[in-house]
């Protein structure tokens, strides 16, 4: 009769590599007498004999996983016990190997230029797949803007037009490669004006063409506004080339106006717009005051409220469809331009512009606007804003578009009446008188004769030494 013998595992369990849906077998050969009872555990949890996912044969020495799932990963142990001595155990790992699989593929994306785009690409696989991206037919290179994240997603910071195109992600491990479908990244660009319409000073009855060029994706549409309303006359010609729209508005000029070009394009439910304005003025318009049609009334706007004299009547030009609104829009546009000028120039220019656009008015039978006195205009031009004026004229000559004051509706000083000829025929700017006395950076002041009735002037006369042309007394 055989002697009892404690169990000995003669073939210890080894690590088993298995592909998903394939068969995996662990062998646990045991020598013992009497025959042992063999049980199996996965991650220390007993595998039940009646679990149909497993097959246990050869008196329990063979464990077969019939169709491996990725959740079967873990440590498998066989435990042999026959009552003689202690139970013995051997363990081995099951590593579930898996070809790459893309679980969350990228989708088509529309993104606005400058924003961040993320194209997802979540993968599964063992070994863990490496993820790369292809744009068009070429492998995509990472840089400071473009990165493949740990998750496999592609992140593009500050999206540029050139990022548009077809993308696919590639997941690769030692067992194979998976490709996503091609997806499209479309980059949309806010409407932007490339070429703003230019302001014109023309004679009554001339033809003027205002040109406005805009770019954007999708291609913008351009509309024109005249003094705040849709353009009522004139013809518009448009052409589109390489996502650039060129619009030309031809006008027959019978009145001055503020013309605004508005470029608009749509991004989903939202619109982006860009605006640029130009003034069309009629040469000698302000000179022929007798022909001016308009009315005198109190100023109700916001922009010039602090500049114009309280309760003063100002002139509203009825050549505009809505004079109050048109003149307010002109001054508002001008005001924004003034943000660029120096602190010395700005208040003086504001005083000049407000009093030029909203001229003091004598009601009478024919409402008559009173232009600014030439001397005050020249003081702004040659003293307070000399630097800005020179820059503006220089840029205008070189054909450049905008410089602080370029688009401002500034008067032509030489055409304004002199306060020496008729002090009642023109408007003074008290601000300048006050500043003249209070700013120490002025040129030296000479005295020669008694002062006229200008607010805040001392009894002695003062003339700016810069030029006798604008002596303010």
């Amino acid at each position: 009769e055989k002697l009892p013998k404690a169990p000995v595992i003669t073939t210890p369990l080894e690590t088993v590599d298995a592909l998903v849906e394939e068969v995996a077998t662990f062998m646990c050969a045991v020598e013992s007498y009497p025959q042992p009872e063999i049980s199996w555990t996965r991650n220390k949890i007993l595998i039940k004999l009646f679990d149909t996912r497993y097959s246990i044969r050869e008196n329990g020495q063979l464990l077969t996983i019939l169709s491996v799932e990725d959740s079967d990963d873990g440590i498998y142990c066989c435990i042999a016990n026959n009552g003689v001595g202690g139970a013995v155990e051997s363990c081995g790992a099951l590593q579930v190997k898996m070809k790459p699989k893309i679980t969350r593929p990228p989708i088509n994306v529309k993104i606005i230029e400058g924003l961040k785009a993320v194209l997802p690409c979540t993968t599964m696989g063992n070994p863990k797949p490496s993820v790369s991206w292809i744009k068009g037919d070429n492998a995509l290179r990472e840089n400071s803007r473009i990165a493949v994240l740990e998750s496999g997603s592609l992140r593009i910071h500050n999206v540029q037009k050139e990022d548009a195109g077809q993308y696919r992600c590639v997941a690769k491990n030692s067992l194979g490669t998976a490709y996503s479908k091609l997806v499209k990244l479309e980059v949309e660009v806010f409407a932007r004006i490339l070429r703003a319409p230019e302001s014109h000073n023309v004679t009554f009855g001339s033809f003027v063409t205002l040109r406005c060029t805009a770019i954007g994706i999708p291609v913008p549409t351009i509309s024109w506004i005249e003094n705040g309303n849709a353009v009522s006359s004139g013809s518009i010609q448009e052409s589109v080339k390489d996502r650039v729209i060129d619009s030309r508005l031809q006008l027959f000029i019978t009145k001055p106006g503020l013309y605004t070009c508005i470029a608009t394009n749509k991004h989903g439910e939202k619109f982006s717009t860009a605006k640029a304005a130009a003034t069309v003025s009629i040469a000698e318009w302000s000179k022929s005051q007798k022909d001016s049609q308009g009315y005198c009334a109190q100023y109700r706007g916001e922009v010039c409220d602090a500049v114009l004299a309280k309760d003063a009547l100002v002139f509203f030009n009825t050549s505009y469809r809505d004079p109050e609104d048109a003149q307010e829009l002109l001054i508002h546009t001008a005001w924004n331009e003034l943000k660029a000028v120096s602190p010395l120039c700005r208040p003086a220019a504001e005083a000049l512009l407000c009093n030029h656009l909203f001229q003091e008015c004598s009601p009478g039978v024919v409402p008559t606007p009173m232009p600014i006195c030439r001397e005050y205009c020249l003081a702004v031009k040659e003293l307070f804003c000399a630097k800005e004026w020179q820059a503006m004229e220089g840029k205008a000559h070189r054909g450049l578009y905008r410089s602080g004051m370029h688009l401002l509706p500034v008067p032509e000083c030489s055409k304004l009446p002199s306060m020496h000829r008729d002090p009642t025929a023109c408007t003074r700017l008290p601000y300048l008188d006050y500043k003249k006395e209070n700013i120490t950076t002025f040129p030296s002041i000479t005295s020669s004769r008694p002062s006229a009735d200008i607010p805040n002037l001392p009894a002695s006369t003062s003339s700016f030494a810069v030029s006798p042309a604008y002596s303010m007394t």
Epitope: A297, Q298, R300, G301, E302, L313, L329, H332
Partner: antibody
Framework: ELQLVESGGGLVQPGGSLRLSCAAS????????MSWVRQAPGKGLEWVSA????????YYKESVKGRFTISRDNAKKTLYLQMNSLKSEDTAVYYC??????????????WGQGTLVTVSS | QAVVTQEPSLSVSPGGTVTLTCGLS?????????PDWYQQTPGQAPRALIY???SRLSGVPSRFSGSFSGNKAALTITGAQPEDEADYYC????????????FGGGTKLTVL
């Protein structure tokens, strides 16, 4: 079609607060001044507050100054009236109205249907 | 603060002409007050008729006209229609002290 739709009215106790909103559609909201006008039951119209197209200034009837605040969100095409320290004399239908131009003052060429504010204990 | 005055009530026969006025308790109404006129029928929101003294809003019948009459602003209805029976309000811009827009007390117009 141009529309102004007021909301936010209701019953509030004296000293309480309400915020009225006016949702605008059918026109370029940021090109126009806006106003609030109220009408007490059986009484006439009373201008309350105004704001220009860009929200750069605000104007109020003397009796509501310091208690009411008008504001606008041009992106949301919405006009607001925040009413604090409400009094029984503020009870009225509050109309939101559109100006015919950019500046705050002038003819009100489009009106909402109004929202009733009742201040009572 | 100045009060804007209007006739409390007026009546007119269909086809007749009626003039509503708008004054100031102190002083005259001028173009600087930019007189505006509104019509309100029961249960409805107001509707603007005339702005800045004499400009008619689009869609407003030509029988409505605005003007000055002495030191007041005036709204004239020439050839009154039954549907013109309503409350009429004038509103004035007051810019002198603090800026304000002031409505008159309204005129109840009856078309008999």
């Amino acid at each position: 079609e141009l529309q102004l739709v007021e909301s936010g009215g209701g019953l509030v106790q004296p000293g309480g607060s309400l915020r009225l909103s006016c949702a605008a559609s059918g026109f370029t909201f940021d090109d126009y001044g806006m106003s609030w006008v109220r009408q007490a039951p059986g009484k006439g119209l009373e201008w309350v507050s105004a704001i220009p197209w860009n929200g750069g200034s605000t104007y109020y009837k003397e009796s509501v100054k310091g208690r009411f605040t008008i504001s606008r969100d041009n992106a949301k095409k919405t006009l607001y009236l925040q009413m604090n320290s409400l009094k029984s004399e503020d009870t009225a239908v509050y109309y939101c109205a559109k100006r015919s131009g950019r500046i705050a003052f002038g003819a009100l060429d489009a009106w909402g249907q109004g929202t009733l504010v009742t201040v009572s204990s | 603060q100045a009060v804007v005055t209007q006739e409390p009530s007026l009546s007119v026969s269909p086809g007749g002409t009626v003039t509503l006025t708008c004054g100031l308790s102190s002083g005259s109404v001028t173009s600087s007050n930019y007189p505006d006129w509104y019509q309100q029928t029961p249960g409805q929101a107001p509707r603007a008729l005339i702005y800045s003294t004499n400009s008619r809003l689009s869609g407003v019948p030509s029988r409505f006209s605005g003007s000055f009459s002495g030191n007041k602003a005036a709204l004239t209805i020439t050839g009154a229609q039954p549907e013109d029976e309503a409350d009429y309000y004038c509103a004035l811009y007051m810019g002198s002290e603090s800026r304000n827009y002031v409505f008159g007390g309204g005129t109840k117009l009856t078309v008999l």
